[in-house]
């Protein structure tokens, strides 16, 4: 069976939107009005992995681009990157480990934990216009909570 996907946007707990910053980076900033059209639309695919009631494995691609968020070690540190893939082969049910995130729902908020690096989360800074990154702390200064807005295909 083909992998199930949906289109969505994400905003962090401070209501910052995610936009492209150069070809291989996302940044978070507050957008209003027509500027909201700049925000990236994700293609969230429901992939193979360990699943529970509040934890669902997903891959996060950028709609209409052959780019996926992935988590790799760079200089011995878990790092979030945008990785290009062959569009003929993605998305797929069995994604490589680095592409998989555990979507965790708590109190109507979403967290995205790296499946490859447990306890590391997609994060944004309090400051405006800063890169989206993989952070190793929850409940600190950096933001790990998001809300999801469905986008019609």
């Amino acid at each position: 069976a083909p992998v199930r996907s949906l289109h969505c946007t994400l905003r962090d707990a401070q209501l910052k939107s995610l936009v492209m910053s150069g070809p291989y980076e996302l940044k978070a900033l507050h957008l209003q009005g027509q500027d909201l059209e700049q925000q990236v639309v994700f293609s969230m695919s429901f992939v193979q992995g360990e699943e529970s009631n509040d934890k669902i494995p997903v891959a996060l691609g950028l709609k209409a681009k052959n780019l996926y968020l992935s988590c790799v070690l760079k200089d011995d540190k878990p790092t979030l990157q945008l990785e290009s893939v062959d569009p003929k082969n993605y998305p797929k049910k069995k994604m490589e480990k680095r592409f998989v995130f555990n979507k965790i729902e708590i109190n109507n908020k979403l967290e995205f934990e790296s499946a490859q690096f447990p306890n590391w989360y997609i994060s944004t800074s309090q400051a405006e216009n800063m890169p989206v990154f993989l952070g190793g702390t929850r409940g600190g200064q950096d933001i790990t909570d998001f809300t999801m807005q469905f986008v019609s295909s």
């Epitope: 790799v72 070690l73 062959d86 490589e96 480990k97």
Partner: antibody
């Protein structure tokens, strides 16, 4: 010091089954990011990746095997298994287990290999 | 599947020579490439990972370079113990695939 030791190889007729074991020491397969893979080498040929298992139980297989092999682990025994069913002559090879950490993979430590011969 | 093609299949060289082995991928594999050395009857040994990072304990005469779909392993000055077969491995996409190998033999 990391060590991996394969066992369970031998001769079997086409259609038969074998279970290979990879006993390891010097690392734990409950450590996040850790993985063990099976790689085989037919006589005089190159290397072919067969299967892989991560610390969290996530498994991957080479689709060329068409579902005949199953990988599993016993974390408490520090052992990874490869159950091979419906064996064919083309499965004749040395089977190595090897350790990696994280994806993308590179295999840091290898066992010495165990030989599987499928012949009537 | 991603096909990995190594060239040459066999390479004859002498001690002290500088040699280069090439690995080509059938599509872009980023820098997700590793190199292994194997001697007859032995298990492979990791030399290089992430295209250019030298595995601990590997002599500095070994180096790796490349990106995208073309990669090279270079041995700057061949030593007697370097005569072996060399394999590349791509880790970009499952199934992970090896090159067919390059046998480095004494001229």
């Amino acid at each position: 010091e990391v060590q991996l030791v394969e066992s369970g190889g031998g001769s079997v007729q086409p259609g038969g089954s074998l279970r290979l074991s990879c006993a390891f020491s010097g690392f734990s397969l409950s450590t996040s990011g850790m993985g063990v893979g099976w790689i085989r080498q037919a006589p005089g040929k190159g290397l072919e990746w067969v299967s892989h298992i991560w610390w969290d139980g996530d498994e991957s297989y080479n689709p060329s095997l068409k579902g005949r092999f199953t990988i599993s682990k016993d974390t408490s025994r520090n052992t990874v298994y490869l159950q091979m069913n419906s064996l064919r002559a083309e499965d004749t090879a040395s089977y190595f287990c090897a350790r990696n950490r994280y994806d993308p993979p590179w295999f840091v430590d290898w066992g010495q290999g165990t030989t599987v011969t499928v012949s009537s | 599947d991603i096909q990995m093609t190594q060239s040459p299949s066999t390479l004859s060289a002498s001690v002290g020579d500088r040699v280069t082995i090439t690995c080509r991928a059938s599509q872009d594999i980023s820098n997700y490439l590793s190199w292994y050395q194997q001697k007859p009857g032995k298990a492979p040994k990791l030399l290089i990972y992430y295209t250019s990072k030298l595995h601990s304990g590997v002599p500095s005469r070994f180096s790796g370079s490349g990106s995208g779909a073309e990669f090279t392993l270079t041995i700057s000055s061949l030593q007697p113990e370097d005569f072996a077969t060399y394999f590349c491995l791509q880790g970009k996409m499952l199934p992970w695939t090896f090159g067919q190998g390059t046998k480095l033999e004494i001229k």
